[in-house]
């Protein structure tokens, strides 16, 4: 009768999370009589995984019936594996006694758990930014193993290069997390743009996971303002319009001022969308010229998305001649743009309209 050996044939076993892991162990002899125990780790802190003689181990099943005669197969099956089960497992033979005495250990089998990364979550900046500014998007995915993972960023299908990625922890762990931050330069055309974070991992069988964020959540496109004026009507009224163009988001308030006094305030709502995702809005004001002795300074004041107001002013010239003498009345767009602290670009020319 040869001396007992405890054989663990596999140095390592890799299992996908959720599956069962079989850890093989055989003894070369029935002698001495005594139970097998399975441990994870070594030393005084080792964790008991299965005890043939006593205890309740709901996730562990012996592969062979322990009551079977001549049984020298002490392999176990662990069900519903999670990343927390990773580690080195030892099959240890004990000699029957009071208490049982540890006799011989197998060489150990390292169990690694292949765990899928969670769906990437992409988060954008907390506040909107305007075109030409750079904003950061963060992508996070958790719970994967092994550590090797590939992350890519795309904007409208084009791969981005300006990003930084970290996988934590740096050392050995049961599972890992990835965090990547990409820097994206905004343009006025980005309302419909999308950034995609793509994560590739061995557990995904070549079918990467994607997380997306819409730049519409991160961008603010400030409006252009433009005045137009129709010819004076027979009733001495002039129709002046303020065109608010190419803005996003829709949240916008427009106030008309006549000679500095608030005439009317409107809120934009249910506007049709331009092809590029921006909005246009036209507001008009009827000015009764005969009611004014002097020129009327009209101001179109636009407050967009909580930003400082942008003003555009327009002078309606009132004629010095009495009306009954058939005098002329003129309305003139002075083209003044009062920007406040805004850096809005004024690309409007000055217009001079004379009405006879």
């Amino acid at each position: 009768e040869e001396e007992l050996q405890v054989i663990q044939p596999e140095k390592s076993v890799s299992v996908a999370a959720g599956e069962s892991a079989t850890l093989n162990c055989t003894a070369t002899s029935l002698i001495p009589v005594g139970p097998i125990q399975w441990f994870r780790g070594v030393g005084p802190g080792r964790e008991l995984i299965y005890h043939q003689k006593e205890g309740h181990f709901p996730r562990v099943t012996p592969v062979s019936d322990p009551t079977k005669r001549n049984n020298m197969d002490f392999s176990i099956r662990i069900s519903n594996i999670t990343p927390a089960d990773a580690g080195t497992y030892y099959c240890v033979k004990f000699r029957k006694g009071s208490p049982d005495v540890e006799l011989k250990s197998g060489a150990g089998t390292e169990l690694s758990v292949r765990a899928k990364p969670s769906a990437p979550v992409v988060s954008g900046p907390a506040v909107r930014a305007t075109a030409e500014h750079t904003v950061s998007f963060t992508c996070e995915s958790h719970g994967f193993s092994p550590r090797d993972i590939t992350l890519k960023w795309f904007k409208n299908g084009n791969e981005l290069s300006d990003f930084q990625t970290n996988v934590d922890p740096a050392g050995k762990s049961v599972s890992y997390s990835i965090r990547s931050t990409a820097r994206v330069v905004l343009t006025r055309r980005d309302v419909h743009s999308q950034v995609i974070c793509e994560v590739a991992h061995v557990t995904l069988q070549g079918d990467p996971l994607r997380g997306t964020a819409n730049l519409s959540e991160a961008i603010r496109v400030p409006p252009f303002l433009e005045f137009t004026q129709q010819s004076m009507r027979a009733d001495n009224q002039v129709n002046v319009t303020c065109q608010v163009m190419k803005f996003y988001p829709q949240r916008l308030q427009l106030t008309w001022l006549e000679n500095g006094n608030v005439s009317r305030t409107e809120m934009a709502s249910a506007l049709p969308e331009n092809k590029d995702g921006t909005y246009n809005w036209t507001s008009w004001l009827l000015v009764n010229v005969s009611a004014h002795r002097d020129d009327v300074k009209l101001t179109c004041q636009v407050e967009h998305d909580g930003q400082p107001a942008v003003n555009k002013s327009f002078s309606v010239k009132v004629s010095a001649h009495p009306k009954e003498q058939g005098s002329n009345t003129a309305a003139e767009n002075t083209g003044t743009n009062e920007r406040g602290s805004s850096d809005y670009k004024d690309d409007d020319d000055k217009h001079h309209h004379h009405h006879h």
Epitope: E1, L30, I31, V33, Q52, E54, T67, K68, R69, N70
Partner: antibody
Framework: QVQLVQSGAEVKKPGASVKVSCKAS????????INWVRQAPGQGLEWIAM????????HYNQIFKDRATLTTDTSTSTAYMELRSLRSDDTAVYYC????????????WGRGTLVTVSS | DIVLTQSPDSLAVSLGERATINCRAS??????????IFWYQQKPGQPPKLLIY???NRDSGVPDRFSGSGSGTDFTLTISSLQAEDVAVYYC????????FGQGTKLEIK
């Protein structure tokens, strides 16, 4: 530690039945065979039968095959041996014993239950 | 069925002397590389106690003055130096097939 606690002594009339219990503790009941052995006064040991509590597989000594029935209740870790059609020569101490190494041996024994068959 | 025959039926040995008990099987009890013989000690009023398993292996807690030997059909239990507490009946048991016991050997002090 392993313990096998047996039920108390019984006095039975010939033709009657007896059911002896053996409550196990200190180990996983379903992982080890339970044997039943008897010893008539001043006589040697006589193996009756064995049962695997995990699946109720049984092996009987041919002498007892028709009269003995082994059962277990895994919820209480208790093994039972029923002997029917008792005769006076069934008077004996009945032992349960646990087979620790699945070698069909008897490593741990109960204290025994005396069954007396007398008219 | 395998029949086990022990000899002698009874034995008286002086304290400190060697005691030898034999067990013969009606056919070989060797299988799968093991001799399926076990030895038990039973003291008055107590259940039997396992001493030796698979012919030659002492069970835990058994003093090393007890030893088992033999192969095939002939087996021996030896007590190298008899102590007073060794007075008992000794049984061999085989389990190459289903368990059977020898008739027992009564050991006394001379």
């Amino acid at each position: 530690q392993v313990q096998l606690v047996q039920s108390g002594a019984e006095v039975k009339k010939p033709g009657a039945s007896v059911k002896v219990s053996c409550k196990a503790s200190g180990y996983t009941f379903t992982n080890y065979w339970i044997n039943w052995v008897r010893q008539a006064p001043g006589q040697g040991l006589e193996w009756i039968a064995m049962i695997d509590p995990s699946d109720s597989e049984t092996h009987y000594n041919q002498i007892f095959k028709d009269r003995a029935t082994l059962t277990t209740d895994t919820s209480t870790s208790t093994a039972y041996m029923e002997l029917r059609s008792l005769r006076s020569d069934d008077t004996a101490v009945y032992y349960c014993a646990m087979d620790y190494g699945s070698l069909y041996a008897m490593d741990y024994w109960g204290r025994g239950t005396l069954v007396t068959v007398s008219s | 069925d395998i029949v086990l025959t022990q000899s002698p039926d009874s034995l008286a040995v002086s304290l400190g002397e060697r005691a030898t008990i034999n067990c013969r099987a009606s056919q070989s009890v060797r299988s799968s590389g093991y001799n399926w013989i076990f030895w038990y000690q039973q003291k008055p009023g107590q259940p039997p106690k396992l001493l030796i398993y698979l012919a030659s292996n002492r069970d835990s807690g058994v003093p090393d003055r007890f030893s088992g030997s033999g192969s095939g059909t002939d087996f021996t239990l030896t007590i190298s130096s008899l102590q007073a507490e060794d007075v008992a009946v000794y049984y061999c048991q085989e389990s190459r097939e289903l368990p059977t016991f020898g008739q027992g050997t009564k050991l006394e002090i001379k």
